[in-house]
C-alpha cells in the first residue's frame, strides 16, 4: 500500500486513509487521512473502502465520528451520538 502520495483507488492507501482528490491539482488523487474530530467533511463522501475514483477532496470521518451539520452548509466530523 502507498502510505502517502499519488493513488487511484482506496486500496492503494494505508489504514486510516482514502484516495481523495488533491486540493491543489484536481486531476490528481492522493492518499489523504480520514477526517479527525473537528475536520470539515461532506456527509455523502464515499465510505472506505470505495472501489471507484472519488470526486471529493476530503475522506470520510474516522470510525466513531459522524459528519454532522453545524450550520446551513457546513459539516464537521463530530462524535457519534
Amino acid at each position: 500500500a502507498v502510505i502517502t502520495g499519488a493513488c487511484d483507488k482506496d486500496s492503494q492507501c494505508g489504514g486510516g486513509m482514502c484516495c481523495a482528490v488533491s486540493i491543489w491539482v484536481k486531476s490528481i488523487r492522493i492518499c489523504t487521512p480520514m477526517g479527525k474530530l473537528g475536520d470539515s467533511c461532506h456527509p455523502l463522501t464515499r465510505k472506505v473502502p470505495f472501489f471507484g475514483r472519488r470526486m471529493h477532496h476530503t475522506c470520510p470521518c474516522l470510525p466513531g465520528l459522524a459528519c454532522l451539520r453545524t450550520s446551513f452548509n457546513r459539516f464537521i466530523c463530530l462524535a457519534q451520538k
Epitope: 482528490v21 484536481k26 461532506h42 456527509p43 455523502l44 463522501t45 464515499r46 465510505k47 473502502p49 470505495f50 472501489f51 471507484g52 475514483r53 472519488r54 470526486m55 471529493h56 477532496h57
Partner: antibody, heavy 121, light 111 residues
C-alpha cells in the same frame, strides 16, 4: 454483460409487507452499491435508498425510514427491498439500479426491469 | 429536501433541431467546484437510462448529441440534433444532499 433481474409483480393488501429481489450478474457484486427507486403510475421517479453490497451499510430516504429495509445476500449476488405497512400510495414500479462508482456523483448506470407492486384492498 | 424543477413540462421539436431542457434546484448542488447533477432518459415501458453524470460527463455509449451544462442551481440538458429515438421523458437528479431528488420530468416529442 451487466444484468439486474427483479422478481415478479406483487399484489398486496394495505398494512401488509412486500419484499422485492434484484439478482445481479456480469460484474463484481460487492464492488458496487445498489440503489432502489420507485415510480408511481404515470408519475416521476422517487429515490428510496441504497446499500453497500460490500458491507451492507445503508442510507435511506427519511420519508421511508422505519418502513423500508434494504439488504443484500452476497452469496447469491442479490439485493432486496422490503417495504412494510403498505398503503395505496405505495403502488408503483420499484427499480433496483447499480451505482456506477463515479465518485460522489451517485449515478445509476444499470437498472433492473422493474417490479410492479399494487396495494389494494 | 432539495426541490428540482424542470422546464418546460413538455417540448415538441422538429427532427434535426435542438432541444433544450432546464432544471433548477432549490439550493446549490455544487461542492468543491463540482456540480452534483445527473440526467436520465426514460422511454415508455422501460427503466431510466443514465445520460449525463456530474452535470457534464457523458455516460459511456450515449451519443454525443447529448450534452449537459450548468452549475449552482441552474442546469441544462441539450440534444443538439433531435432524432426519432430521442422521444422520451427526461429527468434531472441532484446527488449533493440526501435524499437524492429528481425533477418532475420533461416529455420530448417530435413536432
Amino acid at each position: 454483460e451487466v444484468q439486474l433481474v427483479q422478481s415478479g409483480a406483487e399484489v398486496k393488501k394495505p398494512g401488509a409487507s412486500v419484499k422485492v429481489s434484484c439478482k445481479a450478474s456480469g460484474y463484481s457484486f460487492t464492488d458496487y452499491d445498489m440503489h432502489w427507486v420507485r415510480q408511481a403510475p404515470g408519475q416521476g421517479l422517487e429515490w428510496i435508498g441504497y446499500i453497500s453490497c460490500y458491507n451492507g451499510a445503508t442510507t435511506y430516504n427519511q420519508k421511508f425510514k422505519g418502513r423500508v429495509t434494504i439488504t443484500v445476500d452476497k452469496s447469491t449476488s442479490t439485493a432486496y427491498l422490503e417495504l412494510s405497512s403498505l398503503r395505496s400510495e405505495d403502488t408503483a414500479v420499484y427499480y433496483c439500479a447499480r451505482d456506477g462508482n463515479y465518485g460522489e456523483a451517485y449515478a445509476m448506470d444499470y437498472w433492473g426491469q422493474g417490479t410492479l407492486v399494487t396495494v389494494s384492498s | 429536501d432539495i426541490v428540482m424543477t424542470q422546464s418546460p413540462d413538455s417540448l415538441a421539436v422538429s427532427l434535426g433541431e435542438r432541444a433544450t431542457i432546464n432544471c433548477k434546484a432549490s439550493q446549490s448542488v455544487d461542492y468543491d467546484s463540482d456540480s452534483y447533477m445527473n440526467w436520465y432518459q426514460q422511454k415508455p415501458g422501460q427503466p431510466p437510462k443514465l445520460l449525463i453524470y456530474a452535470a457534464s460527463n457523458l455516460e459511456s455509449g450515449v451519443p454525443d448529441r447529448f450534452s449537459g451544462s450548468g452549475s449552482g442551481t441552474d442546469f441544462t440538458l441539450t440534444i443538439s440534433s433531435l432524432q426519432a429515438e430521442d422521444v422520451a421523458v427526461y429527468y434531472c437528479q441532484q446527488i449533493n444532499e440526501d435524499p437524492f431528488t429528481f425533477g418532475q420530468g420533461t416529455k420530448v416529442e417530435i413536432k
